[in-house]
C-alpha cells in the first residue's frame, strides 16, 4: 500500500494509473467503500462522501490512463485509505494528513515560550524536527516547546514531520517582538545633544501600545520616569515628560528621544519599556549615557567620565603631536602643570576610541 503525507489546508494528488493509455471506467472510494468520484460516460461524477465538494480529477489526463484524485483544503479527518478501481484492479493509497500550528499567537515577546502542536490522524506515530531561523534544532512528538524565545528566533521555522519513511515539511513564521538591541550606550561630551534610538526588530501593520523611559542617574539615589508615551498605529504621542531633563520625542517610528544636552547629572542608565496592545508582557531596551568633561583649573588638567563604564575602559590625556600621555583604567585622569598645546581626552576600549574631547592649554607667563 502506498503512503502519502498531506498538510492540513493544502491540496494533495493521489495517483492511479491504468496500464492502457486510454479513457476507461474508474472509481475512487474511501475505506467505507463509498464512492468519492468516478467516470460516467465522459463526465466526472461525485458520490456522497465527505469529499464531494473538495475532490476532483484531471480530466485532461484520462486519455493517458491517468486517473488521479485531487483533494483540496485537506483536513485531518481526510486521513484514510483510498481505493482506486480501474481495469478490474484495485490500488490502495493511505493518506495521512498532518497539521502543525503554534499554540498561541505567532507574534511573541522575547523571553516568552513557543509551543508547536502537531495534529495527526489516530493511529499514526509521527516524529517532528524543527529548525529555527538561527539554525537551532529541536525534536519532539506531538508537541515541540521552545522555552525562551530569543531575538534570533524571529523568522521562518522549518519543521519536518516524518511517518513511515515519508516526510512533509511545514513552514511557520514566528515574529519575536523585541527591540533590535538589548542594550546600547551613547558616549557624549558635556553639552552635546544626545540622541537615543530604539529601533524595533519587527514590523507590524498596526502597532499600538504605551511606553515609558525610567532613568537611574549615577549621581541619584533612586530612578525616575523621564517620559511616558503612547503609540497608536505607529504614531507616537507624549503623555508626560519631566521638566529636568526636558526630553523630546519623535512622532514616528523608530522610537527616538532627544536630550538637549549631555550633563554629568544625567549620566547613568535607563530602561525603555514598551507594552503592546493585546500582548502580555513588555519589550525592554536598556540605554546607557556616558558623559565626558575635560577641564583646566589653575595648574590642573582633568578629564572625567560619568555613567556606566566597564572597568576595562581606558581614560587617557594626551598632548597632540607629543608622546606625553597619562592613561588609567579609571573614571578620572589628570595632569598637573600641563604643557601648553591641544590636549586630547580619550575614552577607549582595547585601542578603539569611544569618546574624545579636546581642550586647549594656554601657556602661563
Amino acid at each position: 500500500k502506498k503512503v502519502v503525507l498531506g498538510k492540513k489546508g493544502d491540496t494533495v494528488e493521489l495517483t492511479c494509473n491504468a496500464s492502457q493509455k486510454k479513457n476507461t471506467q474508474f472509481h475512487w472510494k474511501n475505506s467505507n467503500q463509498i464512492k468519492i468520484l468516478g467516470i460516467q460516460g465522459l463526465f466526472l461524477t461525485k458520490g456522497p462522501s465527505k469529499l464531494s465538494d473538495r475532490a476532483d480529477s484531471r480530466k485532461s489526463l484520462w486519455d493517458q490512463g491517468c486517473f488521479s484524485m485531487i483533494i483540496k483544503n485537506l483536513k485531518i479527518e481526510d486521513s484514510d485509505t483510498y481505493i482506486c478501481e480501474v481495469e478490474n484492479k484495485k490500488e490502495e493509497v493511505e493518506l495521512l494528513v498532518f497539521g502543525l500550528t503554534a499554540n498561541s499567537d505567532t507574534h511573541l515577546l522575547e523571553g516568552q515560550s513557543l509551543t508547536l502542536t502537531l495534529e495527526s490522524p489516530p493511529g499514526s506515530s509521527p516524529s517532528v524536527k524543527c529548525r529555527s531561523p538561527g539554525g537551532k534544532n529541536i525534536q519532539g512528538g506531538r508537541t515541540i516547546s521552545v522555552p525562551q524565545l530569543e531575538r534570533q528566533d524571529s523568522g521562518t521555522w522549518t519543521c519536518t514531520v516524518s511517518q513511515d519513511q515519508k516526510t512533509v515539511e511545514f513552514k511557520i513564521d514566528i515574529v519575536v517582538l523585541a527591540f533590535q538591541k538589548a542594550s546600547s550606550t551613547v558616549y557624549k561630551k558635556e553639552g552635546e545633544q544626545v540622541e537615543f534610538s530604539f529601533p524595533l526588530a519587527f514590523t507590524l501593520e498596526k502597532l499600538t501600545g504605551s511606553g515609558e523611559l525610567w532613568w537611574q542617574a549615577e549621581r541619584a539615589s533612586s530612578s525616575k520616569s523621564w517620559i511616558t508615551f503612547d503609540l497608536k498605529n505607529k504614531e507616537v504621542s507624549v503623555k508626560r515628560v519631566t521638566q529636568d531633563p526636558k526630553l523630546q520625542m519623535g512622532k514616528k517610528l523608530p522610537l527616538h528621544l532627544t536630550l538637549p544636552q549631555a550633563l554629568p547629572q544625567y549620566a547613568g542608565s535607563g530602561n525603555l519599556t514598551l507594552a503592546l496592545e493585546a500582548k502580555t508582557g513588555k519589550l525592554h531596551q536598556e540605554v546607557n549615557l556616558v558623559v565626558m568633561r575635560a577641564t583646566q583649573f589653575q595648574e590642573n588638567l582633568t578629564c572625567e567620565v560619568w555613567g556606566p563604564t566597564s572597568p576595562k575602559l581606558t581614560l587617557s590625556l594626551k598632548l597632540e603631536n607629543k608622546g606625553a600621555t597619562v592613561s588609567k583604567q579609571a573614571k578620572a585622569v589628570w595632569v598637573l602643570n600641563p604643557e601648553a598645546g591641544m590636549w586630547q581626552c580619550l575614552l577607549s576600549d582595547s585601542g578603539q576610541v569611544l569618546l574624545e574631547s579636546n581642550i586647549k592649554v594656554v601657556p602661563t607667563w
Epitope: 467505507n32 467503500q33 464512492k35 468516478g38 461525485k46 456522497p48
Partner: antibody, heavy 120, light 107 residues
C-alpha cells in the same frame, strides 16, 4: 437517540422565501451531513440538498439557484431557505441525517415533516 | 443526474403473498442503492442499504438484490403492517435521487 424536528411557517406567499429550521436533539450535530427532502402531496421524494457541520453544501442542480442552507452548531440547528417560491414548491418538507459507515450510506434519521403551502 | 425508475407504481396483494418491486437506474450504480418504506402520514424509514443488506431491526421477510442498473426488492410474505409506499434511492452520485415509489396495498 437522535431526533429531528422541522419548524417554520406553514404558509408562504408566491415569490417569497420559504424558511425552515431543523433542530437536532438527543445527539450532536457535528460530523454529519444533514439533508432536506421534500414530497409534494401524493408524489415521490425529492432530495433538495445537504449541509455538513463545517458549512459545506451540496444542492440538487434543479433547485440550486434558489436554495441556501446554513448550520448553527451552537444551537444544534440547520436551516433551509428556498427563494422565489411558486405553487410547485407546495410539499411536505423533511429534514434527515445522512450517515456513512462501512458499505452504508443512507438517511437513517428523519424528522416527522412539515407541510408548506405556497399560496397568496 | 441518475434517473431511478421504479415499477409497478402500485400493487395490491394478499396477506402472505410474495411481493416484488423493481428499480432501474439510468447508469451503472454498482450496489449503491437503498430501499425505504414510508407509511401513510409518516417519514420514510431506511430498510435496506448496499442493495441487499438489511438495516438493524428490519424483519427478515424483506430482502433486496441486484447490482449495476437493475435491482429488486422483495417482501417474502406480505403482512398487514407492510402497507406503505416503497422507494429506491441511489447513492452512487450526487444529486441523490429516488425512484417514483411503489404503493403496496392489501387486497
Amino acid at each position: 437517540q437522535v431526533q429531528l424536528q422541522e419548524s417554520g411557517p406553514g404558509l408562504v406567499k408566491p415569490s417569497e422565501t420559504l424558511s425552515l429550521t431543523c433542530t437536532v436533539s438527543g445527539g450532536s450535530i457535528s460530523s454529519f451531513y444533514w439533508s432536506w427532502i421534500r414530497q409534494p402531496a401524493g408524489k415521490g421524494l425529492e432530495w433538495i440538498g445537504r449541509i455538513y457541520t463545517s458549512g459545506s453544501t451540496n444542492y440538487n442542480p434543479s433547485l440550486k439557484s434558489r436554495v441556501t442552507m446554513s448550520v448553527d452548531t451552537s444551537k444544534n440547528q440547520f436551516s433551509l431557505k428556498l427563494s422565489s417560491v411558486t405553487a410547485a414548491d407546495t410539499a411536505v418538507y423533511y429534514c434527515a441525517r445522512e450517515l456513512e459507515k462501512r458499505n452504508y450510506y443512507g438517511m437513517d434519521v428523519w424528522g416527522q415533516g412539515t407541510t408548506v403551502t405556497v399560496s397568496s | 443526474d441518475i434517473q431511478m425508475t421504479q415499477s409497478p407504481s402500485s400493487l395490491s396483494a394478499s396477506v402472505g403473498d410474495r411481493v416484488t418491486i423493481t428499480c432501474q437506474a439510468s447508469h451503472d450504480i454498482s450496489n449503491y442503492l437503498n430501499w425505504y418504506q414510508q407509511k401513510p402520514g409518516k417519514a420514510p424509514k431506511l430498510l435496506i442499504f448496499d442493495a441487499s443488506t438489511l438495516e438493524t431491526g428490519v424483519p427478515s421477510r424483506f430482502s433486496g438484490s441486484g447490482s449495476g442498473t437493475y435491482f429488486t426488492f422483495t417482501i417474502r410474505s406480505l403482512q398487514p403492517e407492510d402497507i406503505a409506499t416503497y422507494y429506491c434511492q441511489q447513492y452512487d452520485s450526487l444529486p441523490l435521487t429516488f425512484g417514483g415509489g411503489t404503493k403496496v396495498e392489501i387486497k
